[in-house]
Interface confidence: low
């Protein structure tokens, strides 16, 4: 049962006002989330009439408001100048109309004496279905049944029981006559158009004994819900079109200056290139509802968006739609951060991800956008540490610098890492952002040995060369684990000859493991940073082996060559990624990655730290 509570039924008379109070649990989230009052259509979809974000529909303009009282967990909907047209089923709720916490309210407005007697009012959304009920007396049971539309002073035949169908209603109307004993016939009109709006007349029989019933059909074009989002932020369009179209192709389109609607994304695989890397169409629920997420909002994304259903995956008249008017606020609370980050093959990137600073305790995530079909974004890493297996040793999410920004570091880059990545949290969804990683020509600035085999109980020295441009940066070594990278004590060893293109001597920072233990096996990162802002990193895998007989410390040239090793690893990663593309959650079990010695291939190069040139030569 929904925790939102309010009056189940409200009744009044025309011209009067009502004040409907709805209660909700006054949790912090509830107090600040959107409140709405919406009207349920024939299919069950609920069209917003008034909301706490300032939206008021045209037929409520000047006579309704919604006031939130967060301190005591209530909101009040005031509606004045009631008319019989206001009778119907409504919801007061929190969040999103189609999916939020809500309470059903039935509003019944009795008709005033000035209204003609017996007119049934049907209020239905465009694209939906209406069933008009037409009662008749027993004596007219065998006689012709018909539905007319009143246009001015004339009545135009729409359908009758002699199989006539007006061309304007072809293939979307049927007249049903029940079995004996039931004194009512129905006319069902599907895929309603705005032009179907108007007064209809049911008729059974002819002459003075004929039965007549007036029906007022009001076909509503969906009022666009006003959506205000921040520049660089994210928007989610939740689309609930009803069970009638659950198995029909879905789309989101944007209305252009010609008042046609350009497809942004659809379930048939079409996607506007302007949204590449920053859009997902989420899977349908069984009721046919779906949602579209767009990140990295730009000013040019503003406009009127429609979601709908049609076998062609694009807008067609007479099919159900839902509408939004998106406004992108340029005075954004979301800070500027690079939308493109460049790295070189073998090198690294450090991506800054913004999040709502009020939600510092939220879980942070980083996912890889995949464009196949409707788009997906399988998670690669999260702040509680779990990393996808194929990213072991080269991906870490850091809480630094904090206060609204976290950092994701990815190293050992290959061309396969080029693509779009999303920063997100389990908090404010509007703070989702997109960054594109591009792999460019060049050499990594930091140089470390390819892979290292350490001998149990002995001393291991791992050098990391950095160019003079990093001389003012803080240098560090850390041991990677699936929960982060633990900084280790390291030693700045002064000049090195590894870089010859530098005016002053390049430098060296070393990590010493003494004595080497089994626990030392794993990935180590050398990196540079300035304060809490991270720069480049380089990774080296240390394998630990038992002490061998004398002389075995010096490995054969074949074993020292790390390059084939890396190719094996690379092709292995490619294989894994190919599987991940087919089934992106393949590696999403978030299981703890074991630090095993064979993660990067079987052979490891031993590094003699006495020669900086030799180390430079074995760097990636």
């Amino acid at each position: 049962k929904s925790p939102v509570f309010g009056p189940q039924e409200v009744s009044s008379v025309e011209g009067n006002s009502v004040s409907i109070k709805c209660y909700y649990p006054p949790t912090s989230v509830n107090r600040h989330t959107r409140k709405y009052w919406c009207r349920k259509g024939a299919s069950g979809r609920c069209i917003t009439l008034v909301s706490s974000e300032g939206y008021v529909s045209s037929n409520y303009a000047g006579r309704a408001n919604l006031t939130n009282f967060p301190e005591n967990g209530t909101f009040v909907v005031n509606i004045a100048q009631l008319s019989r047209d206001d009778s119907g089923h409504y919801k007061c709720g929190l969040g999103i109309n189609s999916r939020g916490l809500s309470f059903d309210v039935s509003l019944e407005v009795s008709q005033g004496p000035e209204l003609p007697n017996g007119t049934e009012v049907y209020t239905v959304d465009v694209g939906r279905t209406v069933t008009i009920k037409c009662p008749f007396k027993t004596e007219n049971a065998p006689k012709t049944k018909a539905l007319y539309k009143k246009i001015g002073q004339t009545s135009v035949l729409v359908i009758d029981s002699r199989n006539y169908v007006n061309p304007n209603y072809k293939d979307r109307i049927r007249l049903r006559i029940p079995g004996t004993g039931q004194l009512i016939f129905t006319v069902v009109i599907d895929r309603l158009r705005l032009s179907d709006h108007g007064l209809y007349l049911c008729q059974a029989g002819d002459g003075s004994n004929r039965d007549e019933k007036n029906a007022d059909l009001q076909v509503l074009e969906p009022e666009p819900e006003l959506v205000y989002e921040d520049l660089r932020g994210s928007v989610t369009f939740h689309c609930a079109l009803g069970l009638e179209v659950a198995n029909v192709a879905k789309f989101l389109c944007r209305v252009n200056s010609r008042e046609t609607c350009d497809v942004v994304i659809n379930t048939l695989g079409k996607r506007d290139s302007a949204f590449e890397g920053r859009i997902l169409l989420n899977p349908q629920d069984k009721d046919g509802s779906f949602s579209v997420v767009i990140t990295g909002l730009r000013k040019e994304d503003e406009g009127r968006y429609l979601c709908g259903a049609h076998s062609d995956g694009q807008l067609q008249e007479g099919w159900p739609i839902q509408a939004w008017q998106l406004f992108v606020n340029e005075e954004s609370t979301i800070p500027r951060s690079p939308t493109v980050v460049k790295g070189v093959a073998g090198g690294s990137v450090a991506v800054l991800c913004p999040y709502n600073p009020k939600e510092s305790q939220s879980l942070k995530y980083w996912c890889l956008w995949e464009g196949a079909q409707n788009g997906r974004c399988p998670l690669l890493v999260e702040s509680q540490g779990l990393v996808q297996e194929q990213y072991e040793g080269r991906l870490s999410l850091l809480q630094e610098p904090g206060n609204g920004t976290f950092t994701v570091i990815l190293n050992q880059l290959t061309t396969q890492d080029a693509g779009f990545y999303w920063c997100l949290t389990n908090g404010d969804t509007r703070w989702r952002t997109t960054v594109e990683i591009k792999i460019i020509e060049g050499e990594p600035n930091l140089k470390v040995p390819g892979n290292v085999t350490a001998v149990l109980g002995e001393t291991l020295n791992i050098p990391c060369h950095f160019p003079c441009k990093f001389s003012s940066y803080e240098k560090y070594w850390c041991k990677w684990s699936n929960t982060g990278c633990q900084t280790l004590p390291s030693q700045d060893e002064g000049p090195s000859e590894a870089f010859v293109n530098c005016d002053e001597n390049s430098r060296l920072v070393s990590l010493t493991l003494n004595p080497v233990t089994r626990a030392d096996e794993g990935w180590y990162w050398c990196g540079v940073k300035q304060g809490h802002f991270y720069g480049e990193t380089a990774a080296v895998y240390v394998a630990v082996e038992e002490k061998k007989v004398a002389g075995s410390r010096y490995v054969s040239p074949a074993k020292a060559d790390a390059a084939p090793d890396e190719k094996v690893l690379d092709s292995g990663v490619r294989e894994i990624e190919n599987k991940a593309i087919q089934d992106p959650r393949l590696f999403a079990e978030e299981k703890v990655v074991a630090d095993t010695g064979d993660q990067a291939g079987g052979s490891r190069a031993s590094v003699d730290s006495s020669s900086s040139e030799e180390q430079g030569g074995s760097s990636k």
Partner: nanobody, 130 residues
Amino acid sequence: EVQLVESGGGLVQTGGSLRLSCAASGRTFSPYAMGWFRQAPGKEREFVAAIRWSGATTYKYVGDSVQGRFTISRDAAGNTVYLQMNSVKPEDTAVYYCAADRVPKDISIDPRNPKDWDYWGKGTLVTVSS
């Protein structure tokens, strides 16, 4: 280590009721979604029901075969989920597995797909006798 522990399974007569519970614990675990799947001998794992939430918004899903008979709910903290089974039938006999997820649920997840759930319990057996 995240743990999901199911309880409440057992023998029940056709037409009777049963309430299953699933408690999540470990690593300050606060899931976005919890759900129930079942697996009868020789059959694939079948979606039963799920509940997911984000802030003040709650979504409940129920599989077609149990619609109108089973309901899913959770405790206020969101770490325990319940499956209320009413009007049970012999075909409801199965091992019932609890599943949980900490992924933001509107990022390309279909709750009916077992692959899209990160954590699983060991299961509790429900036997419906005729």
